[in-house]
């Protein structure tokens, strides 16, 4: 058993049929010694008396808010949550496996640049009695600070018969060094509580591996005289790290016909312009990627050929 | 070439070669073999390899003030990785394919380190750690980790040389 926060405790249980459970001793936070009784949740049934209460925690019915009283007055509360371990593996019932980039991916994170700011998000089908708390650091043995905000519900989607809820959180490394080569990964820890079930989820990454630039901005076409060719130009996104001579991007320019089956013409360039042939009804798209490290491509910025 | 006393390197040549190194490091990575182990091998080799750290002067301001600290750090790293790529980790079982980019990568690391340091001048170099893989699966795991770490190192080096070529070239 360990303390999650003041008066909230997590009991770790091996979860299998007829498991013995864990013996837990609760102590009433009071100077009083006599006449103390214990109850669980809203029930008035007295579970025991005395300053301490010993219980065998085996299932969710044994978890909840234990309250000690004296003469009708509440002295203190202890909320017990359960953390299930099945066959040596902690349960992951609350969050949905996003399966990208690999199985057992519950948290996904992205950064728009090297400033040390990043966003993480996760999915669940649970709509009520759900709380999240997020902590982060750079490294784990001698952790350096990362400050995270509160997790917020950022999207709701309908997936078949189920509603899916997306939560996200923004974090910022306290003393980021954008030009350095990271040697210790960022660790993100999410505590999830649904009713009386506790779970924790972690992700470990380097900022360089979660970089996804915003799409190029100001995408423009300039027709070339007496030619089907056009000059496409664009600019670095505002959110990208500066100076651009140091934090350089590379670009992919694509000409795509109306039909998805039509052959795509692609050009790769380090410049912020390119000359391409503009077919009727086609569109021109440009996306960006870090020039020296193959993290994610940005989403496409597009303009129609006409 | 970076010469003792602090004259400028051939920024443009270094830029071209470091960008080539980036490409080679990424093309070598998937070719060192099928690898599920990398998903689980969470302990980093990072304690064992040199890094371009915050105080090494490799940021734009540090390069403007005095690029020598940074260039020395890059040189150290290049020599270190060049030795690793020539070690038993890459030459031992399982054998690399004959056309593996690791050979080119090895040669390019040496080439860039020579551009930075002429004959007769010696910056300190870091000892290769004893990573002591005794099994082929351990070598394979280390190849992945070393190449991942090299990708990060050469990305910073390439940024340094690109910025130097754009702003510090005579």
């Amino acid at each position: 058993i360990w303390e999650l926060k003041k008066d909230v405790y997590v009991v770790e249980l091996d979860w299998y049929p007829d498991a013995p459970g864990e013996m837990v001793v609760l102590t009433c936070d009071t100077p009083e010694e006599d006449g103390i009784t214990w109850t669980l949740d809203q029930s008035s049934e007295v579970l025991g008396s005395g300053k301490t209460l010993t219980i065998q925690v085996k299932e969710f019915g044994d978890a909840g808010q234990y309250t000690c009283h004296k003469g009708g007055e509440v002295l203190s509360h202890s909320l017990l949550l359960l953390h299930k371990k099945e066959d040596g593996i902690w349960s992951t019932d609350i969050l949905k496996d996003q399966k990208e980039p690999k199985n057992k991916t519950f948290l996904r994170c992205e950064a728009k640049n090297y400033s040390g700011r990043f966003t993480c998000w996760w999915l669940t089908t649970i709509s009520t009695d759900l709380t999240f708390s997020v902590k982060s650091s750079r490294g784990s043995s001698d952790p350096q600070g990362v400050t995270c905000g509160a997790a917020t519900l950022s999207a709701e989607r309908v997936r078949g018969d189920n509603k899916e809820y997306e939560y996200s959180v923004e974090c910022q490394e306290d003393s980021a060094c954008p030009a350095a080569e990271e040697s210790l990964p960022i660790e993100v820890m999410v505590d999830a509580v649904h009713k009386l079930k506790y779970e924790n989820y972690t992700s470990s990454f380097f900022i360089r591996d979660i970089i996804k630039p915003d799409p190029p901005k100001n995408l423009q076409l300039k027709p070339l005289k007496n030619s089907r060719q056009v000059e496409v130009s664009w600019e670095y996104p505002d959110t990208w790290s500066t100076p651009h001579s140091y934090f350089s991007l590379t670009f992919c320019v694509q000409v795509q016909g109306k039909s998805k089956r039509e052959k795509k013409d692609r050009v790769f360039t380090d410049k912020t312009s390119a000359t391409v042939i503009c077919r009727k009804n086609a569109s021109i798209s440009v996306r960006a990627q870090d020039r020296y490290y193959s993290s994610s491509w940005s989403e496409w910025a597009s303009v129609p050929c006409s | 070439r970076a010469v003792p006393g602090g004259s400028s390197p051939a920024w443009t040549q270094c830029q071209q070669l470091s960008q080539k190194l980036c490409t080679l490091a990424w093309s070598a990575h998937p070719l060192v073999g099928h690898m599920d182990l990398r998903e689980e091998g969470d302990e980093e080799t990072t304690n064992d390899v040199p890094h371009i750290q915050c105080g090494d002067g490799c940021d734009p301001q540090g390069l403007r003030d005095n690029s020598q600290f940074c260039l020395q750090r890059i040189h150290q790293g290049l020599i270190f990785y060049e030795k690793l790529l020539g070690s038993d980790i890459f030459t031992g079982e399982p054998s690399l394919l004959p056309d593996s980019p690791v050979g080119q990568l090895h040669a390019s690391l040496l080439g860039l380190s020579q551009l930075l340091q002429p004959e007769g001048h010696h910056w300190e170099t870091q000892q290769i750690p004893s990573l002591s893989p005794s099994q082929p699966w351990q070598r394979l795991l280390l190849r992945f980790k070393i190449l991942r770490s090299l990708q990060a190192f050469v990305a910073v080096a390439a940024r340094v040389f690109a910025h130097g070529a754009a702003t510090l070239s005579p």
């Epitope: - | 599920d36 182990l37 302990e43 980093e44 079982e93």
Partner: antibody
């Protein structure tokens, strides 16, 4: 499908040399390492040695001086030679494939049925 | 050599009940976070069969009632609900250092 089949003498005399052949099919010896493991009657498993994809070998230090493992990739055969046999070497000898280096980390994923070798005069 | 000590030597479990076998290594069998510990099942008159590789990965074709956990020196094989066909001897094996070594085996029987 993947198969490994051991062949060789059932009976050898003390001080003689044992030669066992493992013939494999369904995979190439250039892609997978082969180990030899033995099991004395009613006892546990003992690893003898391995031949890697590139032809290098590692042996159990306890019997290294008596053991040689070689292979012929084109014939898909691995040969175990063990000199100076003794009655304590009586065991079932298994030829075993080591799983893909990058996934299995030294786990042996396919085993032959084994061949019982008795050492007796 | 790395010595693997299995416990218990034998185990009698009722059908449908849980069976747990432990394997302790005399030194760590982890290398950069990878546990080179594997589990085998051997039935009478048959060669051993790989069940779990790298401590916790279920070999293809093996029923999900088998699971493995652990790292460094302490490992566990669990059969969540014992079936009649699970009666066998179970071995752990390490491949972190030469020579590869096996545990002494644990015999699982029906109570």
């Amino acid at each position: 499908q993947v198969t490994l089949k051991e062949s060789g003498p059932v009976l050898v005399k003390p001080t003689e040399t044992l030669t066992l052949t493992c013939t494999v099919s369904g995979f190439s010896l250039t892609q997978y390492a082969i180990s030899w493991v033995r099991q004395p009657p009613g006892k546990g498993l003992e690893w003898l040695g391995v031949i890697w994809t590139g032809g290098g070998t590692n042996y159990n230090s306890g019997i290294k001086s008596r053991l040689t493992i070689s292979k012929d990739n084109s014939k898909s055969q691995v040969v175990l030679t063990m000199t100076n046999m003794d009655p304590v070497d009586t065991a079932r000898y298994y030829c075993v494939r080591e799983g893909d280096y990058g996934s299995y980390a030294g786990a042996m994923d396919y085993w032959g049925q084994g061949t019982t070798v008795t050492v007796s005069s | 050599d790395i010595v693997l000590t299995q416990s218990p030597d034998s185990l009698a479990v009722s059908l449908g009940e849980r069976a747990t076998i432990n394997c302790r290594a005399s030194e760590s069998v982890d290398y950069y976070g990878i546990s080179s510990m594997h589990w085998f099942q051997q039935k009478p008159g048959q060669p051993p069969k790989l069940l779990i590789y790298r401590a916790s990965n279920l070999e293809s074709g093996i029923p999900a009632r088998f699971s493995g956990s652990g790292s460094r020196t302490d490992f566990t094989l669990t059969i969540s609900s014992l079936q009649a066909e699970d009666v066998a001897v179970y071995y752990c094996q390490q491949a972190n250092k030469d020579p590869y070594t096996f545990g002494g085996g644990t015999k699982v029987e029906i109570k």
